[in-house]
């Protein structure tokens, strides 16, 4: 184009529908220039203008010839331009912030603007740039991009931004601009101009203030505090630690805390000091609620549900900032809130939820919430399967009869629809406990009753009870213990009876043992002893307990002695024993030795013995009648171990085995024995009966049974040369080769001749007895042989 013609044609659009084209006027033209602009398209259009720009509808794709004639005083000039969409710039209108507001409590800015989308023909993506500036010096704090879409109508956009610094601390400015990223436009796209700036500032009152106030934040966060002050701030501290000051506008200052530590329950103090004052705030650094742990719901009474949980990790937030809990049941929509006053027991929290009529399945969600967040736990529970009954109360025991009682107790709750499994603990004194399980139908009125049989009469029992539901969730706690004495019953057996003839053979002494408690069935008051023959029955006077012996003058005819035990309810079956023994001529006295504590007796099975066997024993040295104790064993037995606290080692006892037929006893075996053999306590007394030049005849006596302390097995006789009262070694001292020993195992032998001796020589003689329990002490003597003739 000629310099004297219009030149530098440029076109821009702000809405893709209209192009605003402008050019530079020819040099030297004044104000009074007219222009004719012709656009070569489908219809040749020309426009008459008085200015150097023209708004034309957007041209479709392709090249267009634009002719601009300039008509002025000294002639005209023409310029031709080729115009294409690609030469057009898309520059959106300068946006305008409709509203900028702030929530000072959360330090959040809220921005509102219009995208003027109604002027655009197509849907287009828009990129917005938002610029946040701080302080009067307008320091850039944040530049963010925000994407939206134009949709053919004016749309209001909202954007918010949380400031790291409380908004009270400094003035904040906001500007926006936009960029339309239209896919339908092939020209150059440019950013709009920045909008007019808007600002937010806090109007301080007369008091100096520190911000934020009483803020709750997450441990590990960064936080900025500031002090809005009219006087110079000299220092800032968090806790007892100083922090460097960041200067804001005027006297205002800030501090930035990085990675804040967990607070004490009273919070963390932040203070700013001036020459004469201190200004402060408190920050609470803690954690959001942990997911409630071990959420569990159960009922004690099918009236209300108790849900328990553990809060998990501590939040370090207390009081109004502590975690609040809400228990929501989703089927019913009902909920309950946890009151903070209900302080947790042993770190576990609990809530009660009233049960709903005809609802068995509950879907609970426990929501935990504090200023830093929320969490939840869920549990689905069939409450009839989660019954943890209360401890049974008012537990009582009443007699039914001597072997049965009635137990009653109270279990609060409405259990009409379920069954209970109850466990009754039955403890007899000095014996192990027994447990019985009973199934009981649940009731509405809380009172329960059960009968307990198969007990022993006149026995002290301790009862207690606990219950669970039949489906079993948890046992209740045990009820209180109740001690109860069952009533008496007649004794179930007659006393264990024995009889002995007196030493003069004129009287029969009847012995019996007290009945064990489980056979006495009550307190035995007395015994009846009667004596019957074919002709008559003679009853003795009643013998009061604790006498367990009676004496009757009897001839040597055979009588049946009956002993009956009586308690307050009645008499036992009689115990019968014949007065006379069944003779047995074929008896040898045997030797038996025990096993330290007792003695094992064995015998052959005898089918003739139909009632029982009796083993009787006594101390051999005691006078008649020989009776220390007796033991009855069943008729099918062939052995028994007799043990007694009265047995002593080294004491000889007599043992008698009797077999019983038709209440008559026959002596089957007679034994003497020791529980344990010991060595004799004395040496045999011995004398020299005869002496010659080459022999000595020695004679000795028996050792008394008491001093023998075992069965005599033999004698040891030692002899050798030796004199009384000399320093020569005694016979029994070791190392002497000339000492001779004779072991005499024939215990009936009472003499010994020692031959082949030297004449007129002193000999030392020693005699000792031995049992299987050891060798007894020695008895010694010195004898001088006669002179050879």
């Amino acid at each position: 184009q000629k310099k004297g013609a219009p030149h530098d044609l440029k076109c821009v659009t702000n809405n893709l529908q209209v192009w605003d084209c402008y050019w530079k006027a020819p040099s030297g033209t004044g104000r009074g220039t007219d222009y004719e602009v012709c656009i070569e398209n489908r219809s040749h259009s020309c426009y008459q203008l008085e200015k150097t720009n023209i708004k034309i509808p957007a041209l479709s794709h392709g090249d267009y010839e634009i002719t601009i004639n300039s008509l002025h005083d000294f002639g005209s000039s023409t310029s031709k331009f080729t115009l294409n969409e690609q030469n057009v710039s898309l520059i959106p209108d300068t946006p305008e912030i409709l509203n900028l507001s702030a929530d000072f409590s959360t330090s959040t800015l809220y921005l509102k603007w219009n995208d003027r989308g109604s002027v655009f023909p197509h849907h287009s993506n828009v990129i917005w740039e938002i610029k946040i500036l701080r302080k009067e010096s307008m320091e850039l704090v944040k530049l963010v991009t925000h994407n939206t879409t134009l949709n053919g109508k004016d749309t209001l956009h909202h954007w918010s931004w949380a400031s790291d610094m409380p908004l009270e601390c400094a003035i904040h400015f906001v500007e926006i601009r936009c960029y339309i990223d239209s896919l339908h436009f092939s020209g150059r796209k440019e950013w709009s101009d920045w909008s007019p700036v808007k600002n937010i500032s806090w109007m301080p009152d007369s008091q100096t203030k520190v911000f934020p106030q009483d803020k709750v934040i997450l441990v590990g966060s960064d936080i900025t505090f500031c002090c809005i002050s009219q006087e110079k701030v000299l220092s800032a501290l968090i806790g007892h630690t100083n922090c460097p000051l960041i200067h804001l506008d005027g006297e205002n200052v800030a501090i930035k805390i990085h990675n804040i530590s967990v607070s004490a329950s009273s919070g963390t103090n932040v203070v700013f000091t001036t020459e004469d004052n201190i200004f402060g705030t408190v920050i609470f650094a803690g954690y959001p609620p942990d997911t409630p742990q071990q959420l569990n719901c159960e009922t004690h009474d099918l009236k209300e549900i108790l849900c328990r949980w553990n809060p998990g990790r501590a939040t370090a937030l207390v009081g109004p900032r502590a975690t609040s809990y809400t228990l929501l049941e989703s089927f019913s929509g009902k909920y309950v809130r946890f009151k903070r006053a209900e302080a947790p027991t042993n770190g576990s929290y609990q809530l009660f939820f009233q049960m709903l009529p005809n609802q068995e399945i509950y879907n609970f969600t426990l929501n935990a919430h504090n200023p830093l967040g929320r969490s939840e736990s869920t549990i689905l529970v069939n409450i009839t399967e989660k019954v943890y009954p209360h401890t049974p109360t008012s537990f009582k025991v009443k007699d039914i009869n001597s072997t049965a009682v009635k137990l009653s107790w109270h279990l609060p709750g409405n259990f009409a629809k379920i069954n209970f499994l109850c466990q009754i603990e039955i403890k007899k004194s000095n014996t192990v406990q027994e447990q019985r399980n009973v199934t009981i139908k649940g009731v509405e009125n809380s009172s329960y009753l059960v009968a307990l049989d198969k007990l022993n009469p006149y026995t002290v029992y301790t009862f207690r009870i606990r219950c669970s539901t039949e489906t079993f969730w948890k046992w209740s706690k045990w009820s209180n213990k109740k001690q109860h004495l069952t009533t008496e019953a007649i004794p179930s057996k007659g006393p264990d009876t024995w009889r002995e003839w007196s030493s003069d053979g004129k009287n029969l002494i009847i012995y019996w043992k007290p009945l064990p408690i489980n056979e006495a069935n009550g307190k035995i008051l007395s015994y009846n002893v009667s004596c019957s023959s074919d002709e008559e029955t003679q009853s003795l006077s009643e013998i009061p307990d604790p006498q367990h012996k009676a004496e009757i003058q009897l001839d040597k005819n055979d009588y049946i002695i009956s002993v009956v035990a009586k308690n307050s309810v009645g008499s036992s079956p009689p115990s019968k024993i014949a007065s006379m023994e069944i003779p047995n001529d074929d008896l040898k006295i045997e030797q038996v030795v025990g096993m330290g504590k007792g003695i094992l007796l064995t015998w052959h099975y005898d089918p003739n013995m139909t009632c029982d066997y009796v083993i009787k024993w006594c101390n051999s040295s005691r006078s008649e009648p020989c009776l220390m104790d007796w033991r009855k064993v069943p008729s099918n037995s062939t052995e028994t171990v007799i043990e007694s606290d009265q047995f002593r080692p080294g004491v000889r006892y007599n043992f008698f085995l009797y077999g019983c037929r038709n209440q008559g006893y026959q002596l089957l075996r007679s034994m003497i024995g020791y529980i344990e053999e010991l060595a004799p306590t004395v040496a045999p007394n011995f004398t020299v009966e005869d002496t010659s030049a080459d022999s000595i005849l020695v004679k000795w006596e028996d050792i008394p049974v008491e001093e023998l302390r075992g069965f005599l097995r033999g004698y040891l006789f030692y002899f050798g040369k030796g004199e009384r009262d000399t320093s020569k070694m005694r016979v029994l001292e070791s190392g002497r080769s000339d000492i001779k020993v004779k072991n005499i195992t024939d215990i009936s032998q009472k003499t010994l001749r020692i031959a082949d001796l030297q004449g007129k020589t002193s000999y030392h003689l020693v005699l000792r007895a031995y049992t299987d329990g050891g060798v007894g002490p020695e008895k010694s003597m010195y004898v001088v042989t006669k002179e050879n003739s």
Partner: antibody, heavy 116, light 107 residues
Framework: QVQLVESGGGVVQPGRSLRLSCAAS????????MNWVRQAPGKGLEWVAV????????YYADSVKGRFTISRDNSKNTLYLQMNSLRAEDTAIYYC?????????WGRGTLVTVSS | DIQMTQSPSTLSASVGDRVTITCRAS??????LAWYQQKPGKAPNLLMY???NLESGVPSRFSGSGSGTEFTLTITSLQPDDFASYYC?????????FGGGTKVEIK
């Protein structure tokens, strides 16, 4: 653990000078204001001087103003008290204490006796 | 300067007693008050700051209250370890000032 150890005390004649030191360990010394507090025998506590964490500001009790100087060397984790023109009434145990406002840790003290 | 006055100067008490010490400021110090405990021959030990905040590691039987000019330190159940001297201190403005002290002794 936090430790403050005072040194430099002793017997000095009136009008003479003494320099007390306080060696700090177990914490970030440069993040705490530091104080000197003294206690005359059988008497209560008397605050003497404070220095800011960065040494920028210092304050003194009227009784020592112009005679005592508090200073610190953050690179050496050490606090100092330069005491000039000492008087009999300056006799006391001198404690070094951490904290610009509240003294949360104290040294065991060093005894200064001013006597002719 | 702000003057701090403590009362009583001496207090006789037995183990298990509830003990209260009072501190008055000559002008309002808001809550900017600390309490210290000192045992014979030892350095003071911080108990309480900002009138009622318990220092870490101090037993909960110690508590503080008050604001403005009237403050109290309370020991709910006196223990053998608590027989010592107690000082209050204001830190609202320099110079920092201490109370005259209260000696708690065994009755």
């Amino acid at each position: 653990q936090v430790q403050l150890v005072e040194s430099g005390g002793g017997v000095v004649q009136p009008g003479r000078s003494l320099r007390l030191s306080c060696a700090a360990s177990g914490f970030t010394f440069s993040s705490y204001g530091m104080n000197w507090v003294r206690q005359a025998p059988g008497k209560g506590l008397e605050w003497v001087a404070v220095i800011w964490f960065d040494g920028s500001i210092k304050y003194y009790a009227d009784s020592v103003k112009g005679r005592f100087t508090i200073s610190r060397d953050n690179s050496k984790n050490t606090l100092y008290l330069q005491m000039n023109s000492l008087r009999a009434e300056d006799t006391a145990i001198y404690y070094c204490a951490r904290g610009q406002l509240v003294q949360d840790f104290w040294g065991r003290g060093t005894l200064v006796t001013v006597s002719s | 300067d702000i003057q701090m006055t403590q009362s009583p100067s001496t207090l006789s008490a037995s183990v298990g007693d509830r003990v209260t010490i009072t501190c008055r400021a000559s002008q309002s110090i808001s809550s900017w008050l600390a309490w210290y405990q000192q045992k014979p021959g030892k350095a003071p030990n911080l108990l309480m700051y900002k009138a009622s905040n318990l220092e870490s590691g101090v037993p909960s039987r110690f508590s503080g209250s008050g604001s403005g000019t009237e403050f109290t330190l309370t020991i709910t159940s006196l223990q053998p370890d608590d027989f010592a001297s107690y000082y209050c201190q204001q830190y609202k403005s320099n110079p920092l000032t201490f109370g005259g002290g209260t000696k708690v002794e065994i009755k």
